[in-house]
């Protein structure tokens, strides 16, 4: 209806383009823009009971642009979609929906999980840890000498933190019993801590503080690697007992 009025208006005004606002190529006093300059989108804006044409450099949120030889127009995205490239390719879903491959879903497909921050369906990410670093020197109360039963530890880093549905991380540090090297402490060594004496320089960007404590990870799901570790630890305990027997005579 408005468009036909606009056409009548055009017949009454031969110079419809004169005095057009902004990006309008042709316009009328009553209907506003009738057509737009290149690379601009034509959209209808409701003002009270009246719809007027406007020319926009991009379509408003919730609309997408479609090109035709004579006009570029804005069309509404699907009802569940906030921003889109077209009706079939949503780029941001309305609240309560998850985006997956351009579609808005109530629930994510199997094998994917909902990211409630980005409101997307994302791949499940499992924990990844590095190889174990070498065992630390064997120490007892910080000393690396004195024929005592001590402990040694080793650590590994978390390379990839798991997502909500991913496998939790296995422990990132391990401690085992050991025998401090067979030599008497020298005077100067007595108070020196093995950690200070033999500490390797940490790699660039690596800090000891950043290594999570295994205690916080003890409750994690047991994964095959952990089972393996437990078996290894049992073996080690047996070996350690044998060691301690052979060492116990030297006191």
């Amino acid at each position: 209806q408005n468009a036909s009025r606009g056409r009548r208006q055009r017949r009454m005004h031969p110079n419809v383009s004169q005095g057009c606002q902004g990006g309008c190529a042709t316009c009328s006093d009553y209907n506003g823009c009738l057509s737009c300059k290149p690379r601009l989108f034509f959209a209808l804006e409701r003002i009270g009971m009246k719809q007027i044409g406007v020319c926009l450099s991009s379509c408003p949120s919730g609309y997408y642009g479609t090109r035709y030889p004579d006009i570029n127009k804005c069309t509404k995205c699907k009802a569940d979609c906030d921003t889109c490239f077209n009706k079939n390719f949503c780029t941001k879903c309305k609240s309560g929906f998850y985006l997956h491959l351009g579609k808005c879903l109530d629930n994510c497909p199997e094998g994917l999980e909902a990211n409630n921050h980005t409101m997307e369906c994302v791949s499940i990410v499992h924990c990844e840890v590095s190889e174990w670093n070498p065992w630390s020197p064997c120490t007892k109360k910080g000393k690396t000498c004195g024929f005592k039963r001590g402990t040694e530890t080793r650590v590994r880093e978390i390379i990839q933190h798991p997502s909500a549905k991913g496998n939790l991380c296995p422990p990132t540090n391990e401690t085992r019993k050991c025998t401090v090297q067979r030599k008497k402490c020298q005077k100067g060594e007595r108070g020196k801590k093995g950690r200070e004496r033999k500490r390797k320089k940490p790699n660039k960007g690596e800090s000891k503080e950043a290594i999570p404590d295994s205690k916080s990870l003890e409750s994690s799901k047991e994964i095959p690697e952990q089972r393996e570790n437990k078996q290894q630890q049992k073996k080690r305990k047996v070996q350690d007992k044998q060691k301690s027997v052979s060492v116990s005579t030297v006191h």
Partner: antibody
């Protein structure tokens, strides 16, 4: 007129990251989405993803999702594409392009990335 | 993903003759009466250049000897009459679904 000027050629080692820039001029930077497309030597075109310069929202081809990050700087009308954990298969020419009503109508000149040990 | 299969992979055409390139989509790229299929031309060392948008609409500044047709899953690019400067690789591209995809390309050579 619309112009997209990309950063120069890059040579990287496997495992490294690269950040390619695309500076736009001749139009309002926030009006159109920016897309990135790559082309391996003698191969076809492959879409990587997009960014809305107006709000920074981005979306990526699933194939690149865990390795690519797209950002923009509205003050300099520049879009960026960072690709991490590079492998030899990432050797390609990387193009930025403006997306106007479901087609790529303006393209950058391309940035050649070589990944080699 | 929507797979676009272009044929032939290459073709040689004499000056002034017609070149026809086909692009078949693994599923429809139409929605709400619009076909989300575009055609690009690429010459060595240059970025692609938009020729046809929405299956059949000629991009401004592109000569009228280029034309596009088709809907649903079958699309065609025609060049008639072929001129020397048309020697290039031509790609179809769909914008209907995520991820956006391209055909493998058709290389046009002049006889």
């Amino acid at each position: 007129q619309v112009q997209l000027v990309q950063s120069g050629a890059e040579v990287k080692k496997p495992g490294a990251s690269v950040k390619v820039s695309c500076k736009a001029s001749g139009y309002t930077f926030t009006s159109y989405t920016f897309h990135w497309v790559r082309q391996a030597p003698g191969q076809g075109l492959e879409w990587i993803g997009y960014i809305y310069p107006s709000n920074g929202d981005s979306g990526y081809n699933q194939k690149f999702k865990n390795r690519v990050t797209m950002t923009r700087d509205t003050s300099t009308s520049t879009a960026y594409m960072e690709l991490s954990r590079l492998r030899s298969e990432d050797t390609a020419v990387y193009y930025c392009a403006t997306y106007f009503a479901n087609n790529f109508d303006y393209w950058g000149q391309g940035t050649t990335l070589t990944v080699s040990s | 993903d929507i797979v676009l299969t272009q044929s032939p992979a290459s073709l040689a055409v004499s000056l002034g003759q017609r070149a026809t390139i086909s692009c078949k989509a693994s599923q429809s790229v139409d929605y709400d009466g619009d076909s989300y299929m575009n055609w690009y031309q690429q010459k060595p060392g240059q970025p692609p250049k938009l020729l046809i948008y929405a299956a059949s609409n000629l991009e401004s500044g592109i000569p009228a000897r280029f034309s596009g047709s088709g809907s649903g899953t079958d699309f065609t690019l025609n060049i008639h009459p072929v001129e020397e400067e048309d020697a290039a690789t031509y790609y179809c591209q769909q914008s209907n679904e995520d991820p956006l995809t391209f055909g493998a390309g058709t290389k046009l050579e002049l006889k």
